[in-house]
């Protein structure tokens, strides 16, 4: 298809040829093209391209362009050739190639497809059935990410209330750019009756740590010492903790934000791998104090998506006073 636009026409530069589009993995869309026929010999060819909504303009010498995009709607790329990297230079006539999502009734596609990466060890995706689907639909979830050679099928399909879901192992690879990439997801049915739904989950978002595990509570003077086990797989600069202390007598609950802290006081079991400690000041030892802890990722490591871990199991210390 030619976009015959007077503003983008130049006399010297012919359009690119053989523009084609293909899909790799689940959501990697790749456009390739050949140089224009009869391009000026003194022209160092560069290619101008942008998507249909004039977004993501790019000028580059390569004869290909790719994008990772959930194929839930039609996407088009327009490409032209020019003799410099100057954005103000008018490229040749722009050639356009589009790719449409798989066929199917849009009302049959699953909705609210979302995934959470639990403790950097497994990903759990969930979705709601589309409006035009039969209640006995058997769903299949496929996933792909950079460290997989091929697309995998998720085996652990489950149902929780109205939601369907599936979970699969996804372990953080140490010392790599693993987390700078994404997981590509597709959900369809075994019978091929529903329109497939796609999602792309960046590995820097939707991360939910496991809850901490409280190991020990002890008093020293009027201070309460709390020791807990950190969730595995995270580095210390990427987590912080919320320690909640409820006092039965005063009916107050105090909340403290805590950095992962070394267990240096003699009151703590020292040098225990992967544990943190915190001293809560001014706690009444002769009353019942109940402690619970949850953990959240730091926005400098993972995108802010408001995902706290579940609360730890509560642990109590002190005596509940008899009401007189």
């Amino acid at each position: 298809d030619y976009k015959d636009d007077d503003e983008s026409r130049t006399e010297t530069q012919p359009p690119v040829t053989n523009l084609s589009v293909s899909v790799e993995n689940l959501c990697t869309v790749i456009w390739t093209w050949n140089p224009p026929e009869g391009a000026s010999s003194n022209c160092s060819l560069w290619y101008f391209s942008h998507f249909g909504d004039k977004q993501d303009k790019k000028i580059a010498p390569e004869t290909r362009r790719s994008i990772e995009v959930p194929l839930n709607e039609r996407i088009c790329l327009q490409v032209g050739s020019q003799c410099s990297t100057n954005e103000s230079e008018k490229p040749s006539i722009l050639v356009e190639k589009c790719i449409s999502p798989p066929e199917g009734d849009p009302e049959s596609a699953v909705t609210e497809l979302q995934c959470i990466w639990h403790n950097l060890s497994y990903m759990k995706c969930s979705w709601l059935p589309g409006r035009n689907t039969s209640p006995d639909t058997n769903y299949t979830l496929y996933y792909w990410h950079r460290s997989l050679e091929k697309i995998h099928q998720c085996e652990n399909i489950f149902r929780e209330g109205q939601y369907f879901g599936c979970s699969f192992d996804l372990t953080k690879v140490k010392d790599s750019s693993f987390e700078q990439h994404s997981v590509q997801i597709m959900v369809k049915d075994n019978a091929g009756k529903i329109k497939p739904s796609f999602n792309i989950v960046p590995l820097t978002s939707r991360v939910k740590p496991d809850p901490p595990h409280i190991k020990n509570l002890s008093f020293h003077n009027d201070d309460l010492y709390v020791q807990w086990e950190n969730p595995q797989n995270f580095i210390s600069r990427c987590l912080f903790y919320e320690v909640e202390v409820n006092n039965s007598q005063t009916e107050t609950h105090n909340v403290f934000y805590v950095q992962e802290a070394k267990c240096e006081n003699p009151e703590f079991e020292r040098n225990v791998e992967n544990t943190s400690c915190f001293m809560v000041p001014g706690v009444l030892p002769d009353t019942l104090n109940t402690v619970r802890i949850r953990v959240k990722t730091n926005k400098l490591c993972y995108e802010d998506d408001k995902l706290w871990s579940n609360w730890s199991q509560e642990m109590s210390i002190g005596k509940k006073r008899n009401s007189t």
């Epitope: 990427c238 912080f240 950095q259 959240k296 730091n298 400098l300 802010d304």
Partner: antibody, heavy 118, light 104 residues
Framework: EVQLVQSGAEVKKPGESLKISCKGS????????IGWVRQMPGKGLEWMGV????????RYSPSFQGQVTISADKSISTAYLQWSSLKASDTAMYYC???????????WGQGTLVTVSS | EIVLTQSPGTLSLSPGERATLSCRAS???????LAWYQQKPGQAPRLLIY???SRATGIPDRFSGSGSGTDFTLTISRLEPEDFAVYYC?????FGQGTKVEIK
């Protein structure tokens, strides 16, 4: 007591290089991020970037990426902010601050005034 | 990129009055990450509130923070003479432009 002590005021010419410092004490220097904040004369606060001295991991605000370099020497509990070629527009007060994982700046240095003028 | 907009730009009040400062985020943010600072002329800023509502160590209880999502508030219940200053809200790499609380 947590303290961050910054190096003294500097007067420089455009094109010169500069490295200012921020020494932490009274806490585990390697366990907290250090952030740098710029305040131009009569203006508000601007977040420049952070470093985690434990592993020297840095993050820059897009406006300051490539303009400054943040580094740290954990053996002497000191963080640095440096310029390879100063401009008149770099004239400002620069603060370092301790930056816990929840993102507030809970302890601040006294500030280093940098004046760049020909 | 999240933008924090503070209002009003300047608040003219008398000692003993209540001050209400607003900070609005351009998109919903986690309240865990919202902080408030006070800055007096010639001094470094001082942390008042973190996690939207938790008072920092040594901050008097006349200062309180509230809010969630996109709307956050710093309240000074009764202004003391030493409270006249500039107040900033912050979320990680973004600061609001500041609200000046001045004596009427």
């Amino acid at each position: 007591e947590v303290q961050l002590v910054q190096s003294g005021a500097e007067v420089k010419k455009p094109g010169e290089s500069l490295k200012i410092s921020c020494k932490g004490s009274g806490y585990s220097f390697t366990s907290y991020w250090i952030g740098w904040v710029r305040q131009m004369p009569g203006k508000g606060l601007e977040w420049m970037g952070v470093i985690y001295p434990g592993d020297s991991y840095t993050r820059y605000s897009p406006s300051f990426q490539g303009q400054v370099t943040i580094s740290a020497d954990k053996s002497i509990s000191t963080a640095y902010l440096q310029w390879s070629s100063l401009k008149a527009s770099d004239t400002a007060m620069y603060y370092c601050a301790r930056f816990p994982n929840w993102g507030s700046l809970d302890h601040w240095g006294q500030g280093t005034l940098v004046t760049v003028s020909s | 990129e999240i933008v924090l907009t503070q209002s009003p730009g300047t608040l003219s009040l008398s000692p003993g009055e209540r001050a209400t400062l607003s900070c609005r985020a351009s998109q919903s943010i986690s309240s865990s990450y919202l902080a408030w600072y006070q800055q007096k002329p010639g001094q470094a800023p001082r942390l008042l509130i973190y996690g939207a509502s938790s008072r920092a160590t040594g901050i008097p209880d006349r200062f309180s923070g509230s809010g969630s999502g996109t709307d956050f508030t710093l309240t000074i219940s009764r202004l003391e003479p030493e409270d006249f200053a500039v107040y900033y809200c912050q979320q990680y790499e973004t600061f609001g432009q500041g609200t000046k609380v001045e004596i009427k």
